[in-house]
Amino acid sequence: ALDTNYCFRNLEENCCVRPLYIDFRQDLGWKWVHEPKGYYANFCSGPCPYLRSADTTHSTVLGLYNTLNPEASASPCCVPQDLEPLTILYYVGRTPKVEQLSNMVVKSCKCS
Amino acid sequence: ALDTNYCFRNLEENCCVRPLYIDFRQDLGWKWVHEPKGYYANFCSGPCPYLRSADTTHSTVLGLYNTLNPEASASPCCVPQDLEPLTILYYVGRTPKVEQLSNMVVKSCKCS
């Protein structure tokens, strides 16, 4: 699986999850988030050669098409597969609000 | 929606579905497929600027991060959203077999 366990331990050039730390205040301008100050959002990148973690029949077909037609611009792309939520704390007035934001952290990637 | 209705009618540079005809025999080497000879598989391509059909909170965050940090290499990618099946005819011995292959045709795209 192209997940953090594999990708963070290996020097993998092809599609894999990469570490990316985002600081809410500096990187997004979200000054209202009290905790955490930032988090590892991660991202997916790297080429998708034929059959690499192909997501659908279409991505398999496209990968094969690309292999047999190297000049073609139509190739699968490395995108998030499994995402996890992130819990944040912020204030509404004086009331602390704890909220779970869905799909914030990339745990694995796929070729789609 | 970044679907065939919109994308095939507009000269859209950003993420959109593009027409791609695949000939089973010539492009894939699938000589066993009797009918059809080929089909419009289509594919997704084009940049994913900030907020273009963002798929998840992560792609929204990544798009925003990329906008505020233009030198960053972490950006969402244009990939299939809605896919449709394709019915093919092939022979097993002299017996014709009709089969529906799932997720063969891209109908719309998203930034993921």
Epitope: G29, W30, K31, Y90, Y91, V92, G93 | T57, L68
Partner: antibody, heavy 119, light 112 residues
Amino acid sequence: QVQLQQPGAELVKPGASVKMSCKASGYIFTSYWITWVKQRPGQGLEWIGDIFPGTGSTNYNEKFKTKASLTVDTSSSTANMQLSSLTSEDSAVYSCARKLGPNYAVDYWGQGTSVTVSS
Amino acid sequence: DVVMTQTPLSLPVSLGDQASISCRSSQSLIHSHGNTYLHWYLQKPGQSPKLLIYKLSNRFSGVPDRFSGSGSGTDFTLKISRVEAEDLGVYFCSQSTHVPFTFGSGTKLEIK
């Protein structure tokens, strides 16, 4: 420049619902909260609630929790507010505005949508 | 709910005069973080409100330095050192320390 565009007026019947829009331009939509305010002549301003386009997070004034529903469409940089079970008490000007966080001051306002509830 | 009481309701002034508007809250507006979330707006006829002062005493960008905000806890004042014709309209105070956020009823600044 920052702009929040709202339709000028809506005429609706009692008991019906109305959905009004607020199209944002000139800034990064997912960096700011959108707040909604009700203004009736001689009654002052009332805070309805806030929504954050970046995550879809919402906060409501308890008074409007069953009356108003806030949503966003990030692809078109548009915030929406739906008001349900309308009565004459809901006749007012509804303005959207933006702010950097729930506790921050509103720095730019829309022109407001005038809602008239009448049979 | 925190009640914001503004006085006077109407303030007739001559151009060039100093004007002072008072706003009193029914509870302290000092947040646990130390900030006082008290803001001032000006609304001209047929227009949407414009931000003048945020967080007690900070002038918003483009606001002339003849406007100043002061106060602490529950008593706040907006001062205009030399009233100009463009300053006429209704002034509102607003608090965002307590939920629900509330507004004053307004003070109409008009020519004597």
